[in-house]
């Protein structure tokens, strides 16, 4: 007789998952000499004990401590980019301006981007078949636990000034819901972030409003505001060229701007 | 020095096709925008079309929507407007015109021009 | 489609003297507005941008204002190389349109 299984409303852990975290930490470590001395297998063994045999809806962030413990890493505190809702430009931006970092550019970051994973409780068992949804059906699940954990670790890292692409085509340019709105921003440290300067990414050509006016974003200057934290914010018009000039700082279109 | 020479002009029969050619240079090409706009004798001017960076977008006036069509050769530093279906009303000088494209403000006017090409329509 | 209205058509000005110039727009369209200036035979000439930012090269007796639907071009002391027609042009919305133009001339 088949064994019952909770049905999650989300789908289930990314097939091949423990290879697939396995293998891009071995590529990371190869490619980041800083993080050489780390053991993938330890690592991994960090991971899978922060979600087996544990039901799926009662994960905490103490669970994932050893795996934290682990991937400690020292980013430069000042070349820090978050963002919301727009992670493949800002991914785009890192590739080419590679002393700034998005937390995918971090090794515990670089493990679980795209990925989903849960086990299912008193059984050593991954769950290929589904995972519980945020909203549908619990928010401390494995998948939410692990980037609310990694992410305020993230912004409390931070300094001097941190940069945040948003979404411009969004109807809610900033959303307090998001990782960035309800963990990221709430994390960084007065003490060592001087100004948290966002850039609005447009989404075409058709829309030349200030988004920076836009009243989303003049309630993260507000909420940032009131942590003694400046505010800056950057219409991005024409982000195709915002890439193009980051390759290509000297050509003269782009630093003839005023 | 920006230059942008156009040429392709010349007396077309109505329904006939015309293909303009605008060979840029004096600056990096991939990094603007480009458009083409247009002054019928006598008249005043009308955009027609422009096309983004890598030719990701193209925009057109409804005048001219479904008969025109932009792009470039960003490899050739040249823009082209190839022209179909052609009417008396099209009758017009051809300019074609750089967008200064900023990142951080908005544009949308044109900064430098070429000395237009003249397409005349008529049987 | 934005319709972009210029006044007058014609201005007769004597060299030396002020020119003002108007634009307005069927609807606001911010301060994305530009002016241009052409010769007979010639291309457009970029003079401002921005409804108030000169271009490279404009000499400062060129001036722009104005926000939303009325703008204004003025042309502080009037050269005999200014004598020419003088368009607007909004780019806030897709398409972008010209005014019908304004033609200077010597009185």
């Known amino acids: 007789v088949p064994r019952w299984r909770q049905q999650w409303s989300g789908p289930g852990t990314t097939k091949r998952f423990p290879e697939t975290v396995l293998a891009r930490c071995v590529k990371y470590t190869e490619i980041h000499p800083e993080m050489r001395h780390v053991d993938c297998q330890s690592v991994w063994d960090a991971f899978k004990g922060a979600f087996i045999s544990k039901h799926p809806c009662n994960i905490t962030e103490e669970d994932y401590q050893p795996l934290m413990k682990l991937g400690t890493q020292t980013v430069p505190c000042n070349k820090i980019l978050l963002w919301s809702r727009i992670k493949d430009l800002a991914h785009q931006f890192t590739q080419v301006q590679r002393d700034m970092f998005t937390l995918e550019d971090t090794l515990l970051g670089y493990l679980a981007d795209d990925l989903t994973w849960c086990g299912e409780f008193n059984t050593s068992k991954i769950n290929y078949q589904s995972c519980p949804d945020w909203r549908k059906d619990c928010s401390n699940n494995p998948v939410s636990v692990f980037w609310k954990t990694v992410s305020r670790r993230f912004a409390e890292a931070a300094c001097d000034v941190v940069h945040v692409m948003l979404n411009g085509s969004r109807s809610k340019i900033f959303d307090k819901n998001s990782t960035f709105g309800s963990v990221e921003v709430h994390n960084l440290q007065p003490e060592k972030v001087q100004t948290l300067e966002a850039w609005v990414i447009h989404g075409g050509r058709e829309d030349s409003r200030d988004l920076c006016q836009d009243p989303t974003i003049k309630e993260l200057e507000s909420i940032i505001s009131k942590r003694n934290i400046q505010f800056s914010c950057k219409n991005i018009y024409r982000p195709d060229k915002f890439l193009q000039c980051v390759k290509n700082p000297e050509d003269s279109s782009c630093t003839s701007e005023i | 020095e920006v230059q942008l020479l156009e040429s392709g002009g010349g007396l077309v029969q109505p329904g006939g096709s015309l293909r303009l050619s605008c060979a840029a240079s004096g600056f990096t090409f991939s990094f603007y925008d480009m458009s083409w706009v247009r002054q019928a004798p006598g008249k005043g001017l009308e955009w027609v079309s422009t096309?983004?960076?890598?030719?990701?977008?193209?925009y057109y006036a409804d005048s001219v929507k479904g008969r025109f069509t932009i792009s470039r050769d960003n490899s050739k530093n040249t823009l082209y407007l190839q022209m179909n279906s052609l009417r008396a009303e099209d009758t017009a000088v051809y300019y074609c015109?750089?967008?200064?494209?900023?990142?951080?403000?908005?544009?949308?006017?044109?900064?430098?021009w070429g000395q237009g090409t003249l397409v005349t329509v008529s049987s | 489609e934005i319709v972009m209205t210029q006044s007058p058509a014609t201005l007769s000005v004597s060299p030396g003297e002020r020119a003002t110039l108007s634009c307005r727009a069927s609807?606001?369209?911010?301060?994305?507005l530009a002016w241009y200036q052409q010769k007979p035979g010639q291309a457009p000439r970029l003079l401002i941008y921005g409804a108030s930012t000169r271009a490279t090269g404009i000499p400062a007796r060129f001036s722009g204002s104005g926000s939303g639907t009325e703008f204004t071009l003025t042309i502080s002391s009037l050269q005999s190389e200014d004598f020419a027609v003088y368009y607007c042009q909004q780019y806030n919305n897709w398409p972008w349109t010209f005014g019908q133009g304004t033609k200077v001339e010597i009185k």
């Open positions: 015109a750089r967008d200064p494209s900023y990142i951080y403000s908005t544009s949308g006017y044109f900064d430098y």
């Open positions: 609807q606001s369209v911010s301060s994305n």
């Open positions: 096309i983004t960076l890598h030719g990701g977008d193209t």
